[in-house]
């Protein structure tokens, strides 16, 4: 069975949008008007993972690109990256753990926890135009809350 996916955009709780910054990085910045077309569209796939009553495992691919957000250790630190995959094999229901995020909904906001590194979250900085990264703190300076906007296929 093909994995169930939906197309969406994400904005952090300060309404910053996510855009490509070079071939393998995302950054967060405020966009308006026609510039909104720059924001990345994700293909969010519902995959197998350590699902709970309040966590839904998903993979976040870039729509019509063979790139997925993944979590790996770099210099002993959990790190967010965009990883290139074989489009013939992805997306799939049984994604490798590094590609899986636990989507957590709290007060109409979403958090994306790394399945590979529990308590590490997709994060943005308060500052404009900074990379999207994997952060190990919630409720601090960095932003871990997002809203999702559905995009029609």
């Amino acid at each position: 069975a093909p994995v169930r996916s939906l197309n969406c955009t994400l904005r952090d709780s300060q309404q910053k949008s996510l855009v490509m910054s070079g071939p393998y990085e995302l950054k967060a910045l405020h966009l308006q008007g026609q510039d909104m077309e720059q924001q990345v569209v994700f293909s969010m796939s519902f995959v197998q993972g350590e699902e709970s009553n309040d966590k839904i495992p998903v993979a976040l691919g870039l729509k019509e690109k063979n790139l997925y957000l993944s979590c790996v250790l770099k210099d002993d630190k959990p790190t967010l990256q965009l990883e290139s995959v074989d489009p013939k094999n992805y997306p799939k229901k049984k994604m490798e753990k590094r590609f899986v995020f636990n989507k957590i909904e709290i007060n109409n906001k979403l958090e994306f926890e790394s399945a590979q590194f529990p308590n590490w979250y997709i994060s943005t900085s308060q500052a404009e135009n900074m990379p999207v990264f994997l952060g190990g703190t919630k409720g601090g300076q960095d932003i871990t809350d997002f809203t999702m906007q559905f995009v029609s296929s």
Partner: antibody
Framework: EVQLQESGPGLVKPSETLSLTCTVS????????VSWIRQPPGKGLEWIGL???????YYNSPLKSRLTISKDNSKSQVSLKLSSVTAADTAVYYC????????????????WGQGTLVTVSS | DIQMTQSPSSLSASVGDRVTITCQTS??????LNWYQQKPGKAPKLLIS???NLRPGVPSRFSGSGSGTDFTFTISSLQPEDFATYYC?????????FGQGTKLEIK
């Protein structure tokens, strides 16, 4: 060798809370999930819910409001609590280890305890 | 939730017979189906995972096949110790759901 052993009172009064413990050996509870399954006398198997290695839980909808699954990794024990029991909760209760093989076979249950019969009666 | 339809619910057979049990799921589950054997007073034992993968130590007379929504479990030549109840389980998504069981009895 992987082993799971359920324990707890065999008789619980209606409206009280059923409490069971699953003690495991041969694997670490921080690495593998554990499910609870029950089987009423002469009937089929019903999956109750599970607790993952990281401590997150998934409860099957029919029992969700009455169910608590928790664990103590250091004691290698998983506990099940089911509140407000009725005669319909009379069953053999099993705990089972999840395979936890990411990107291959995450949700299967490969090793089971021998089960413990719980009777709900006054 | 995924609904499971297992048939037959009971089956009488003789030693040496070939026996087939089927399991149908309400949704496509790829190959995420397991088969368990349960003897009276004992815990279920996993025989086959992922539709066709024989677990270590399980005799080769047991086999499984199928994908999507239709699955088959076969015992090629029944042995006296095979008389038991057999259950299918979908391991595609939570909540996990079992078939109703097939009781295999001596004819």
């Amino acid at each position: 060798e992987v082993q799971l052993q359920e324990s707890g009172p065999g008789l619980v009064k209606p409206s009280e809370t059923l409490s069971l413990t699953c003690t495991v050996s041969g694997f670490s509870l921080s690495d593998f999930g554990v499910s609870w399954i029950r089987q009423p006398p002469g009937k089929g198997l019903e999956w109750i819910g599970l607790i993952w290695g990281g401590g997150d839980t998934y409860y099957n909808s029919p029992l969700k409001s009455r169910l608590t699954i928790s664990k103590d990794n250091s004691k290698s024990q998983v506990s099940l609590k089911l509140s407000s029991v009725t005669a319909a909760d009379t069953a053999v209760y099993y705990c089972a280890k999840q395979t936890n093989l990411w990107a291959y076979d995450l949700y299967s249950m490969d090793y089971w305890g021998q089960g413990t019969l719980v009777t709900v009666s006054s | 939730d995924i609904q499971m339809t297992q048939s037959p619910s009971s089956l009488s057979a003789s030693v040496g017979d070939r026996v087939t049990i089927t399991c149908q799921t309400s949704q496509d589950i790829d190959e995420d189906l397991n088969w368990y054997q349960q003897k009276p007073g004992k815990a279920p034992k996993l025989l086959i995972s992922l539709a066709s993968n024989l677990r270590p130590g399980v005799p080769s007379r047991f086999s499984g096949s199928g994908s999507g929504t239709d699955f088959t479990f076969t015992i090629s030549s029944l042995q006296p110790e095979d008389f038991a109840t057999y259950y299918c389980l979908q391991s595609d998504r939570l909540p996990l759901t079992f078939g109703q069981g097939t009781k295999l009895e001596i004819k």
